[in-house]
Amino acid sequence: QRFAQAQQQLPLESLGWDVAELQLNHTGPQQDPRLYWQGGPALGRSFLHGPELDKGQLRIHRDGIYMVHIQVTLAICSSTTASRHHPTTLAVGICSPASRSISLLRLSFHQGCTIASQRLTPLARGDTLCTNLTGTLLPSRNTDETFFGVQWVRP
Amino acid sequence: QRFAQAQQQLPLESLGWDVAELQLNHTGPQQDPRLYWQGGPALGRSFLHGPELDKGQLRIHRDGIYMVHIQVTLAICSSTTASRHHPTTLAVGICSPASRSISLLRLSFHQGCTIASQRLTPLARGDTLCTNLTGTLLPSRNTDETFFGVQWVRP
Amino acid sequence: QRFAQAQQQLPLESLGWDVAELQLNHTGPQQDPRLYWQGGPALGRSFLHGPELDKGQLRIHRDGIYMVHIQVTLAICSSTTASRHHPTTLAVGICSPASRSISLLRLSFHQGCTIASQRLTPLARGDTLCTNLTGTLLPSRNTDETFFGVQWVRP
């Protein structure tokens, strides 16, 4: 009984349950392959509990192992379109601090119009994740077609 | 030592570890695009710990943020078959209560025969999740090819 | 306060937070369709906390429900290559003990060059997971393109 009470009294943050799910805000200017994200209940079903957005990029606030997941769907796309505009590639990586820059997850669309994947990776407080979309097809902004999120799993 | 004992005595449900993994039971009648799911140890490796099935649809029993994941493979399918049939799309959404109806996750097969994705989303007690498959190709009932599940992540 | 202290003193292992993320080491000899994995901080961002590697295959150390995820990208691949070398299939399963042998997750590449999926499944201490790649195309060893992992979710 005492444990249950204590558990309820502890702030969730102290349990390390950092989590975020983001929706696409906009693409970058011409020479910037990054996707810019947004999140918050006012926008729909996106949210940030722990991590923060820094100019549309996701910044981690707690060290740990995270499950990172993403889905990106190309707008006005068919397998014909996709193959004619090949190659379109999505890469998720740590883009800052520069000393920790690395690609975590990379997928090409080939003849498809959607990519979706997930992976476990260690992230540190201050790591900023960037999602780079190369190619000439625009990503869909529909919230059920394009989204990006992280979930703290363990220290 | 005392904490470890207390932890073992607490029912898992009180920790909020609701989780379910379902296998395909059958498709709906002519005008019903929903997939009907089943779960339980007698059926193989599917299970429900917390959520319940209501006429083949998954009903949530605990408020929180959930990781929802799905894989659907089309039966007797090749990239040629897939391209020669009406676009096949899968959508996962809250279908009841009607006031909370929304599409959470949507994917098209294009020239592929399998879609797989996952996302984090807030769900509330009583939310029923439906998986709508539009198109004219039958989904595989093999348990390693088609499955649908949710995992409670945090309040 | 007492609970917070106790929580910090408890080893993570006692909370059941077993987790692993692996990178591809090599493919098997001619008649062996298995992929051989490796993990550890010295190799990059792969790691094993709880599970172990047994001759390149992942062995589970704690009973429970796990989230299993995988991404495999074929090397030097285009949709044309993929369709000419079809069928290439990836299956993740329990390969030992033999009494528990079962396919958990299966995907074909069709005209694509990457597959990615995830599922929840019960696993028991001693279960060894194998990932079988059939086909004539080589998997990429890039750590952001090919990876395999498990995450303990609940008892």
């Epitope: - | 002519q30 007797i76 391209s83 009406h86 004219t136 190709l137 039958l138 | -």
Partner: antibody
């Protein structure tokens, strides 16, 4: 209500071609593949091929591959089956058919078109 | 091509009695959790009518005296209590792969 209405009976000479039409109504024409099945007098059923009206992409039974062409006109929701180099054994009732939800079995059939090949 | 063999070629059954028609495929038509076998009824001068799909699913509007069973290569259509309006030729068809093929048909008559 789904309906498939076929063109009328035809009499053709050996070596000629015949083009049978099938007009679909009661559903979204571009959604469902339309199949052609033939039945010689007093004989069984034989699948000839199908067409996906969304793109016009067709698949044919190898037996007829060199002689059959399936096309569609989305503006009139009509599909056509043309069989060339006719011979007497092509005398049959030709049916168009489609399905109700998933492809592979045929819930809706046209009334049939009798094609007689005779010199 | 998968060859479908129906038996018997013809069958005479008394009204109210059970009629059983068999269909054997030259190789398995079961995969992905389904058996891709379907049954049709055809009366003279009419197109075939779908009775059973995927081995054991009754098509909407079809009387429940019709049932299907089987898996792999061997399948059965059963009419539990034959009625006068059931006099017809019955065909099996597979859709496991292209080309789809039909059985040769079984003629059901009243004894």
């Amino acid at each position: 209500e789904v309906q498939m209405v076929q063109s009328g009976a035809e009499v053709k000479k050996p070596g000629a071609s015949v083009k049978v039409s099938c007009k679909a109504s009661g559903y979204t024409f571009t959604t469902y593949n339309i199949h052609w099945v033939r039945q010689a007098p007093g004989q069984g059923l034989e699948w000839m091929g199908d067409i996906y009206p969304g793109t016009g992409d067709a698949s044919y039974n190898q037996k007829f591959r060199d002689r059959v062409t399936m096309t569609r006109d989305t503006s009139t929701s009509t599909v056509y089956m043309e069989l060339s180099s006719l011979r007497s054994e092509d005398t049959a009732v030709y049916y168009c058919a489609t399905f109700s939800r998933f492809d592979g079995w045929f819930a809706y059939w046209g009334q049939g078109t009798l094609v007689t090949v005779s010199s | 091509d998968i060859v479908m063999t129906q038996s018997p070629d013809s069958l005479a059954v008394s009204l109210g009695e059970r009629a059983t028609i068999n269909c054997r495929a030259s190789r398995s038509v079961s995969t992905s959790g389904y058996s891709y076998m379907h049954w049709y009824q055809q009366k003279p001068g009419q197109p075939p009518k779908l009775l059973i799909y995927l081995a054991d699913n009754l098509e909407s509007g079809v009387p429940d005296r019709f049932s299907g069973s089987g898996s792999g290569t061997d399948f059965t259509l059963t009419i539990s209590s034959l009625q006068a309006e059931d006099v017809a030729v019955y065909y099996c068809q597979h859709s496991r792969e292209l080309p789809y093929t039909f059985g040769g048909g079984t003629k059901v008559e009243i004894k």
